[in-house]
């Protein structure tokens, strides 16, 4: 599933065609089944408020390049999801760009309310990547990338939970650059601070910087993993965590490796190679398929390192759901 | 646009075979293809489909009995150990689905008899 | 799994007459992925309707289908001797997968 999104071609960057990332890769989406859900959830992700319509693609100039493919054959939300990748999706098998799916938001300049209060990542794909804002005495500052580092990064990622940051040689776009007073510059963190407010840093607005130099962050999703409907932690159906959505995994090329890597990273010992029928003692899922054809060498610490189709693309039902037991 | 198969022949059971379709006038990079077989005097059965990315999808009772792989201008059907009932015409095809564009081969017989 | 039913195994018509041949499906249908095929013997399918009612290239518009959920219609009004064939519902369902009906045998009397 898409690791980024964004509106292309719009006389704001709030209506657009669709792109979405997948593997550092900008694609389009196919329209088939593209509705007003699937907007609504995408301006929510964009912090772009609320839905206006479902345009085609193709009114948007300059439009997509050949060369661009067509990356989801459809996406199906339910409305109330925070993100497209949350969204049930298909990988694309009969699509053209003259079927781009395009999207217009009411409010170019809302902005999601970002949890915790005090700082946001605006301007991005979803809350766990972009321009760094913090609030002071009710106002949004944009923070200058003089001495900021990798750790102030670490300080952010954490606060708003989204996992470990990334090293990104990232700039903020044109587009995306910040219209509000510039907070602060010489952030000095340790890296081990609760919020970025307890880093050090320069006095409160006076610095020399402009939004060339407005900091840009990027957070990896959490991944974790859980077995679950088993009399212990160590056995069950398995469940993988991703854009804060727990789901379940398909059986299709599942063994041994994949097992074992499992059990090593829930701290679970061996498996203990259970039989099909074991496996199936825990019942199907619900919800989410996240991952299918998983492959391991079993070297791997965690199933996140292991080959896979992209997020949520499978050709399964919850009857071949994965289930583990590991030794404990 | 054009889709043609090849490789059907007589097998006896349990020899692994391998189908080619080869395409011209339209580009695997952006368009799935897939596999549908037919049965002398039966209905048509979709067995898989693969996706421009490589990867594949499966009917349900096709998993493990068949395997779809590509290159970037043939698709290729694996059929890992054959039984009689696998005695069809085997097409090749993209489906056209949402877009109506659908192109389908001639089809190539198996045959799998002792 | 998705099981694509046609009722009737064959039908009959007579030449200028109207034919309906249905299909039902055991679940809802993917963003409308129903389509009609045609098969003459010794030939591949040929596609009819794709989207429910969409008429496909070159497709006389004699052929109409219609329907909703999980019910679908296909309908040819002034048929023809050439229309003499076997017709197939197909459906597709989330995950790209596709089904194909049993398919119904149009005779023309």
């Known amino acids: 599933s898409p690791s980024g999104v964004r509106l292309v071609g719009g006389l704001h960057r709030c209506e657009g065609r669709v792109e979405v990332e997948q593997k550092g890769q900008w694609g389009t989406v196919c329209d088939d089944g593209w509705d007003i859900k699937d907007v609504a959830v995408l301006c929510r992700e964009l912090g772009c408020g609320a839905a206006s319509g479902t345009p085609s693609g193709i009114l948007y100039e300059p439009p997509a390049e050949k060369e661009q493919k067509v990356l989801i054959q459809s996406v199906s939300c339910t409305g109330t999801e925070d993100t497209l990748a949350q969204c049930e999706q298909e990988e694309v098998y009969d699509c053209s760009h003259d079927e781009d799916a395009g999207a217009s938001c009411e409010n170019p300049e809302s902005s999601f309310s970002p949890v915790p209060e005090g700082v946001r990542l605006a301007d991005g794909p979803g809350h766990c990547k972009g321009r760094v804002e913090v609030k002071h005495q009710n106002q949004w500052y944009t923070v200058c990338q003089t001495g900021w580092s990798l750790r102030a990064a670490k300080v952010v990622c954490r606060q708003l939970g989204c996992g470990r940051a990334v090293l990104t040689q990232k700039r903020c776009n044109k587009h995306a650059y910040g219209r509000k007073p510039i907070w602060l510059s010489q952030m000095s963190c340790s890296g081990r601070e609760a919020t970025l407010q307890d880093c050090p840093s320069g006095p409160w607005g006076k610095n020399t910087c402009n939004h060339d130099e407005d900091t840009w962050v990027e957070c990896e999703d959490p991944f974790d993993l859980r077995l679950v409907g088993g009399d212990n932690l160590c056995s069950g159906r398995l469940e993988v965590l991703h854009k804060g959505v727990w789901g379940s995994v398909c059986d299709d090329n599942w063994g041994e490796k994949e097992d074992q890597v499992v059990c090593k990273q829930l701290g679970c010992g061996k498996s203990l190679s259970p039989s099909f029928r074991d496996r199936k003692c825990y019942g199907p899922g619900v919800g989410r398929i996240w991952l299918d054809n998983v492959r391991c060498s079993g070297e791997e610490q965690s199933l996140e390192q292991c080959q896979h189709r992209f997020w949520g693309f499978h050709d399964c039902t919850h009857q071949e759901d994965v289930a583990v037991i590991c030794s404990g | 646009q054009s889709v043609k198969e090849s490789g059907g022949r007589l097998v006896t059971p349990g020899t692994p075979l391998t189908l080619t379709c080869t395409v011209s006038?339209?580009?695997?990079?952006?368009?799935?293809m897939s596999w549908v077989r037919q049965a002398p005097g039966k209905g048509l059965e979709w067995i898989g489909l693969t996706f421009p990315s490589g990867s594949a999808s499966y009917a349900s009772w096709a998993k493990g009995r068949f395997t779809v792989s590509r290159t970037s201008t043939t698709v290729d059907l694996n059929l890992t150990s054959p039984t009689t009932e696998d005695t069809a015409t085997y097409f090749c095809?993209?489906?056209?689905?949402?877009?109506?564009?659908?192109?389908w081969g001639q089809g190539t017989l198996v045959t799998v008899s002792s | 799994e998705l099981v694509m039913t046609q009722t009737a195994s064959s039908v009959s018509a007579a030449v200028g007459g109207t034919v309906t041949i249905s299909c039902q499906s055991s679940?809802?249908?993917?963003?409308?992925?129903w389509s009609w095929y045609q098969q003459k013997p010794g030939q591949p399918p040929k596609l009819l309707i794709y989207?429910?009612?969409t008429l496909a290239s070159g497709v006389p518009s004699r052929f109409k289908g219609s329907g909703s959920g999980t019910q679908f219609t296909l309908t040819i009004s002034g048929v023809q001797c050439d229309d003499a064939a076997t017709y197939y519902c197909a459906g597709g369902y989330s995950g790209t997968i596709f089904t194909f009906g049993g398919g119904t045998e149009l005779e023309i009397k």
């Open positions: 006038g339209f580009s695997l990079s952006s368009s799935g």
């Open positions: 095809a993209h489906v056209g689905a949402t877009t109506g564009r659908d192109f």
């Open positions: 989207q429910a009612s």
């Open positions: 679940q809802n249908i993917y963003n409308n992925r």
